[in-house]
Amino acid sequence: AQNITARIGEPLVLKCKGAPKKPPQRLEWKLNTGRTEAWKVLSPQGGGPWDSVARVLPNGSLFLPAVGIQDEGIFRCQAMNRNGKETKSNYRVRVYQIPGKPEIVDSASELTAGVPNKVGTCVSEGSYPAGTLSWHLDGKPLVPNEKGVSVKEQTRRHPETGLFTLQSELMVTPARGGDPRPTFSCSFSPGLPRHRALRTAPIQPRVWEPVPLEEVQLVVEPEGGAVAPGGTVTLTCEVPAQPSPQIHWMKDGVPLPLPPSPVLILPEIGPQDQGTYSCVATHSSHGPQESRAVSISIIEPGEEGPTAGSVGGSGLGTLA
C-alpha cells in the first residue's frame, strides 16, 4: 500500500489508477477507516450521507473534503478500463495535526542551588498524533532522572476533536557554583516523521546560592564564652549572604522573645544567663539556617576557664 500523510482539516484526493477519465466507469472504492467497522463501498453513482466525508469524483478519484482523525485507515480502488483490464490502487492514510507553538507556563524566576526546584510547565495544545515534549538546558537535551533532573508528564485528549494536549513539568537541582543564569527551553516533536520540532521561547531564571550552614558564624566576646559574674558577653551572628537575612536568637533550643538583630549583648551576667546560645538566619525566600551553639558560663573567682555544664535561666540579653 502507498503511504499517504494528510493534515487534519485539509482536502485529500486519492487517484484510482486505471480508471477511465470520464463516466461511464466500472470502479468502486472500498474503505476501512475509523468511520467504518468493516469495508464501506463507495461508487461513482453513490452520493449520499458519506459525501461529507468522501465522495467519488467524475474522474474516479476519491475526494475527502476535510480529512479527520477517523479517516485514518485503508482506501482501495478497483477499476476496469474500456478493454476490461483490472487495476487496483491501495492507500494507507495517516493524518496529523501540528499544534500551536508550545509555551512554558508557571515558570520560576529564581531557582535555589542544591535543592529541587520546579522550573516550569511546558504545554502543547492540539497535536495529532500525540508527539512528545522534551526539555533543553543551554540548547542541550535534558535527560530525566539524571543529575537531579525529573519530569512529570501528562497527556489529555480533547473529547470532541480528538487532538492531544501535552504537559511536562520540569524539576531540577542546580549544582552549587554552577551557571547563575541557565537557559531552559522546551520543544515539541511530532509523532509523525518529517516534521520539524517546535521550540518554546527560552526562560532564564536566576540561580540563588543559599548560604551553607557552616557560613552562619557565631562570634563570642570574650572568646570561649566564660565570664566573671557581672561581666558582659557580646554574641555576633555573621552571615555573608546578601541581602542580609533576619537574625533571631535561641537559648537552650528555645527562641528568645527579642526583635531580630545580628548582635546580642548580655550585660551583667548572672547565673540565669548561663546556657547554650545560637543564632538563626532566615532569608526571605529560603528556610532558616542555624549557627553552631556556644556555651556561656560564669567563672567563679579563682577558676580557670569555663565551668562544666550550665544552668538555664530566664534572663534576657540586650540587643545592640
Epitope: G48, P49, W50, D51, S52, V53
Partner: antibody
C-alpha cells in the same frame, strides 16, 4: 443554543406551489448539512431532502425528486424548500433538521410547519 | 433502498418496567443509526446517536446497542414522561430511512 424555526406552511391547492423557510441560529450554519423531514397526519417520519454545507450538492428521495428543491443562504443562516406540483399526499408537518450526513445524522429539529394540500 | 423494520409497533408498559424496541436494517448500515423520541404535537428529539451514544441531556436510563444489522433502544426503568412514540433512523445511505415507529403506552 441551537434553534431552528420553520415558516411558510399553509393551505395550497393540488398542483400549486409553496416555499418553506427555516431560520437557524445558535451554531455555525455553514458547517452543517441541513435536511427537511415530513410527517403526514397520524403517520411516521419521512425524509424529504438534504443539502450539503456549501449548498453545492442536494439529495432527494424519488417521491419528491423533480418537484421539490432544497436550497440555502449561508449569509442569512437560512434553509429553504421550494415545493411545486403539490399533491394531496404531500400534506404533512414539515420539519427542518440539522445534519443529514454520517457525521451528524439528525441532531436538532425545528417545531415544524403544517402544509395542507387540498381543493 | 434500505428498509428499517421496527418492532413492536406499539406496546403497553407500566412505570418502572424495562422496555426494549428493535430496528432491523435490510442491509449493513454500520453504526449510522439514531433513535428519536416524539411526543404528540412536538418535534422529534434525538436520544441516541451512532447506535450506542447517549445524546446530551438524555437520561441514562436510555441506552442503545447494536448486533450486526439489529439495533436496540432500551429504557431501563420507564418513567411517566417516557410515554411517547420512538423512531429509529439509518443515515448510512440515501434515501435516509426511518423505522415505522413504536408507540409506548401506559398499561
Amino acid at each position: 443554543e441551537v434553534q431552528l424555526v420553520e415558516s411558510g406552511g399553509g393551505l395550497v391547492q393540488p398542483g400549486g406551489s409553496l416555499r418553506l423557510s427555516c431560520a437557524a441560529s445558535g451554531f455555525t450554519f455553514n458547517n452543517y448539512w441541513m435536511t427537511w423531514v415530513r410527517q403526514a397526519p397520524g403517520k411516521g417520519l419521512e425524509w424529504v431532502a438534504s443539502i450539503d454545507n456549501s449548498g453545492d450538492n442536494t439529495y432527494y428521495p424519488d417521491s419528491v425528486k423533480d418537484r421539490f428543491t432544497i436550497s440555502r443562504d449561508n449569509a442569512k443562516n437560512s434553509l429553504y424548500l421550494q415545493m411545486n406540483s403539490l399533491r394531496a399526499e404531500d400534506t404533512a408537518v414539515y420539519y427542518c433538521a440539522r445534519g443529514g450526513d454520517i457525521v451528524v445524522g439528525l441532531d436538532h429539529w425545528g417545531q415544524g410547519t403544517l402544509v395542507t394540500v387540498s381543493s | 433502498d434500505i428498509q428499517m423494520t421496527q418492532s413492536p409497533s406499539s406496546l403497553s408498559a407500566s412505570v418502572g418496567d424495562r422496555v426494549t424496541i428493535t430496528c432491523r436494517a435490510s442491509q449493513d448500515v454500520g453504526i449510522y443509526v439514531n433513535w428519536f423520541q416524539q411526543k404528540p404535537g412536538k418535534a422529534p428529539r434525538r436520544l441516541i446517536y451512532r447506535a450506542t451514544n447517549l445524546a446530551d441531556g438524555v437520561p441514562s436510563r436510555f441506552s442503545g446497542s447494536r448486533s450486526g444489522t439489529d439495533f436496540t433502544l432500551t429504557i431501563s426503568s420507564l418513567q411517566p414522561e417516557d410515554f411517547a412514540t420512538y423512531y429509529c433512523l439509518e443515515f448510512d445511505e440515501h434515501p435516509l430511512t426511518f423505522g415505522g415507529g413504536t408507540k409506548v403506552e401506559i398499561k
